[in-house]
């Protein structure tokens, strides 16, 4: 990869292992726990990350309402299952034979099953609603400030097409980014928003995936946009399938 | 030129373990991985996992988890695995072997037989 | 895991005949990112290591015979022997190297007729 020529690193994605092994003794950096060869170039994908991680050595309102279809990652991590193409397998299960239906970002869409459970095809979360509160600040950050500032974050650190940042809504203290992709407005090479929101999740935390560079240093105008809190609500483009209880519990 | 020279044959008991050595010369060790292969008498090949000296990542196929342990010395540039609670099954003929899309570099194999 | 499966499992071919083996693999072993097909031959005669003859999918291996060639992307690959010699008598394998755990298909035994 040309991005990860020069001292064979991967600038993308720290979770890899680069080595001169490439065709023609190039460099070529395989994702930790997949072996798959990762394009150093773009973001890796959210279900190379996962697995990644899992193998790593342990050491008025203008606020969107989430739709009542919205799905919120509450089962954290686990060990995914990844196709050939790094994306996540339509069903995933766990080392006791426990199985369920995921989206196109890792988040489970359906109640728990057996290995008899099917899922037909991977749906497309296609809407993702980043829900964020920063700490107090003097003032309210200028709404249109923040906007740009937020939408050439994701343009120039995630390599997003500005057309997915669908808006920016700010009430102070709360801040929500939506991004919205169909299947139809994907192109080949288009990094898709699910990468681009988990790389952005994680560098909140504190957690960058990128090789090498510094953490996250958000500013309006100059001053710092610290985040205390994160939510994150998924849409699907068809709506989810649990059962009646999970609804009412 | 690059070359992996691999430890002699084993004959070994039921319930016994052996440590199979690899040592490789000709390159930098610590930036490529490196693997294991067993091939039974008469059978095809199977990866059992790999190593990567450098950062000392390890990944094994699921079915030799608990059956095989991969470590590397890079003072020695030196691999290793070690079979464990041997079994008749697991006499073959054991290959290190460079890895990589055009790593064409294996060790000459390791017979380790299984006999009471 | 991926299922790498040869056909034939054995093949017959005069000297100077053209010999064909086919892999087919369970998945496909082309990477999006960077358009590589994650797929190699091997050759091996008795009592020696595999001999490296082709990686991605299509690169003969330096010192490798012209008259061996791989083709093929995705999931269906074919090792070409154009014009076959004695000393091409072997097994040949196929082996996917794209995603853990790597995986070889049951090998093809290559005999003179």
């Known amino acids: 990869h040309t991005a990860a020529q020069d001292n064979c690193t991967c600038p993308t994605n720290k979770m890899t292992v680069c080595s001169p092994d490439g065709p023609g003794g190039r460099c070529q950096c395989r994702a930790l726990g997949s072996g798959m060869a990762v394009d150093c170039s773009t973001l890796t994908s959210k279900c190379l990350l996962l697995k990644a991680r899992m193998s790593a050595p342990k050491n008025a309102r203008t606020l969107v309402r989430p739709s009542e279809h919205a799905l919120v990652d509450n089962d954290g991590l686990y060990d995914p299952d990844c196709d050939p193409e790094g994306r996540f397998k339509a069903r995933q299960c766990n080392q006791t034979s426990v199985c369920w239906c995921v989206n196109s970002v890792g988040v489970r869409r359906t109640d728990k099953g057996d290995l008899s459970l099917r899922c037909d095809e991977l749906v497309r979360t296609h809407h993702i609603l980043i829900d964020l509160r920063h700490r107090p600040t003097a003032g309210a950050f200028n709404h249109s400030d923040l906007d740009a500032e937020l939408r050439r974050l994701f343009r120039e650190r995630y390599r997003l097409h500005p057309k997915f940042v669908a808006a920016v809504h700010y009430e102070q203290p709360t801040i929500q980014i939506e991004l919205r992709q169909n299947t139809s407005q994907k192109a080949a090479g288009d990094v898709d928003i699910g990468d681009a929101a988990y790389y952005f999740e994680r560098d909140i935390k504190g957690e960058s995936l990128f090789q090498g560079r510094g953490g996250l240093d958000l500013r309006v105008r100059g001053e710092p946009l610290q985040v205390e809190r994160t939510l994150i609500y998924y849409l699907d483009e068809i709506p989810p399938k649990f059962s009646m209880k999970r609804l009412t519990a | 030129q690059v070359q992996l020279v691999q430890s002699g044959a084993e004959v070994k008991k039921p319930g016994a373990s052996v440590k199979v050595s690899c040592k490789a010369s000709?390159?930098?060790?610590?930036?490529?991985?490196l693997g294991w292969v067993k091939q039974a008498p008469g059978q095809g090949l199977e990866w059992i996992g790999n190593?990567?000296?450098?950062?000392?990542?390890?990944n094994y196929n699921e079915k030799f988890k608990g059956k095989a342990t991969i470590t590397a010395d890079t003072s020695t540039s030196t691999a290793y695995m070690e079979l464990s609670s041997l079994r008749s099954e697991d006499t073959a003929v054991y290959f290190c072997?460079?890895?990589?899309?055009?790593?064409?570099?294996w060790g000459q194999g390791t017979l380790v037989t299984v006999s009471s | 895991d991926i299922v790498m499966t040869q056909s034939p499992d054995s093949l017959a071919v005069s000297l100077g005949e053209r010999a064909t083996i086919n892999c087919k693999s369970s998945?496909?072993?082309?990477?999006?990112?960077?358009?590589?097909?994650?797929l190699a031959w091997y050759q091996q005669k008795p009592g020696q290591p595999p001999k490296l003859l082709i990686y991605?999918?299509?690169t003969r291996e330096s010192g490798v015979p012209d008259r061996f060639s791989g083709s093929g992307s995705g999931t269906d690959f074919t090792l070409t022997i154009s014009s076959l010699q004695a000393e091409d008598v072997a097994v040949y394998y196929c082996?996917?190297?794209?995603?853990?755990?790597?995986?070889f298909g049951q090998g093809t035994k290559l005999e003179i007729k």
């Open positions: 072997a460079r890895e990589g899309s055009n790593s064409g570099y």
């Open positions: 000709g390159y930098t060790f610590t930036i490529y991985w």
């Open positions: 190593i990567f000296p450098g950062s000392a990542y390890i």
């Open positions: 998945q496909s072993l082309l990477n999006s990112g960077n358009q590589q097909n994650y």
């Open positions: 991605g999918a299509s």
């Open positions: 082996q996917s190297d794209h995603i853990y755990p790597y995986t």
